[in-house]
């Protein structure tokens, strides 16, 4: 999913059906003055960045696992 500039939300689209084994780390951004929505940005093991749907139960599980493993910020 394309990442926009920091002056607004970064996630224009979210990626569906990503596997936990492909994810290196996850960054979760809370709403702020630049963006009204929660954003989940995954760094994949191949170096690419991908936006995930924060409302998806699968993504919530990924965040929980990453938090346990210390791979989320």
């Amino acid at each position: 999913a394309p990442l926009a500039t920091e002056l607004r939300c970064q996630c224009l689209q979210t990626l569906q059906g990503i596997h936990l084994k492909n994810i290196q780390s996850v960054k979760v951004k809370s709403p702020g003055p630049h963006c009204a929505q929660t954003e989940v940005i995954a760094t994949l093991k191949n170096g690419q960045k991908a936006c995930l749907n924060p409302a998806s139960p699968m993504v919530k599980k990924i965040i929980e696992k990453m938090l346990k493993n210390g791979k989320s910020n």
């Epitope: 002056l7 607004r8 939300c9 003055p33 630049h34 963006c35 009204a36 929505q37 929660t38 409302a55």
Partner: antibody, heavy 118, light 109 residues
Framework: EVQLQQSGPELEKPGASVKISCKAS????????MNWVRQSNGKSLEWIGN????????SYNQKFQDKATLTVDKSSSTAYMQLKNLTSEDSAVYFC???????????WGQGTLVTVSA | QAVVTQESALTTSPGETVTLTCRSS?????????ANWVQEKPDHLFTGLIG???NRAPGVPARFSGSLIGDKAALTITGAQTEDEAIYFC????????FGGGTKLTVLQ
């Protein structure tokens, strides 16, 4: 279609508290922060604060830190704002407002008139 | 607390271009102030127009655009229409959103 439906008008006595609601529909409630804004004397707007339902985190305008309490009920997709120790200066129309990808204040509720009078 | 100042009223005609501005008491408005523009029509009907200085909200006509002009944030309506008659508020971010007093825009036929 995004909709924010606010509760009806309130008439309260000085010193009382009031809790107003904003029921959201047409989107995934937890993903977007909910702002609260007030309009006094039919003109100026003041930002009260914001509630992030995803992490249950609030941000307040310092002016309203001791006046307003923002909460949500995720199960009913409803945001609430409680105002305490009301004075005549709190008489205003209060709005909830949700953002979009582009802007913080994209979608607004219809407003709730709060009148504080002895 | 910073003060945000707008023109109190402006008048334009259909088809004309009009620019509303938003000044900060703390100095030049920058992209870090994340300027937002909101339209108010009668009966408390609010609609967000612009966020992050120049990002148009969903469904907002292309004639509305946001920018920085000199030391101010600006909302330009290119080819104003009678339905654009409204009050326009800007909001700037400091450590909270601070709204200006609003500009009443009249579109005279």
């Amino acid at each position: 279609e995004v909709q924010l439906q606010q509760s009806g008008p309130e008439l309260e006595k000085p010193g009382a508290s009031v809790k107003i609601s904003c029921k959201a529909s047409g989107y995934s409630f937890t993903v977007y922060g909910m702002n609260w804004v007030r309009q006094s004397n039919g003109k100026s707007l003041e930002w009260i604060g914001n509630f992030d339902p995803y992490f249950s985190v609030t941000s307040y305008n310092q002016k309203f830190q001791d006046k307003a309490t923002l909460t949500v009920d995720k199960s009913s997709s409803t945001a609430y704002m409680q105002l305490k120790n009301l004075t005549s200066e709190d008489s205003a129309v209060y709005f909830c407002a949700r953002g979009s990808w582009e802007t913080i204040f994209a979608y607004w509720g219809q407003g709730t008139l709060v009148t504080v009078s002895a | 607390q910073a003060v945000v100042t707008q023109e109190s009223a402006l008048t334009t005609s259909p088809g004309e271009t009009v620019t509303l501005t938003c000044r900060s008491s703390t100095g030049a408005v920058t992209t870090s102030n994340y300027a937002n523009w909101v339209q108010e029509k009668p009966d408390h009907l609010f609609t967000g127009l612009i966020g992050g200085t120049n990002n148009r909200a969903p469904g907002v006509p292309a004639r509305f655009s946001g920018s920085l002009i000199g030391d101010k944030a600006a909302l330009t309506i290119t080819g104003a229409q009678t339905e654009d008659e409204a009050i326009y508020f800007c909001a700037l971010w400091y450590s909270n959103h601070v709204f200006g007093g609003g500009t009443k825009l009249t579109v005279l036929q």
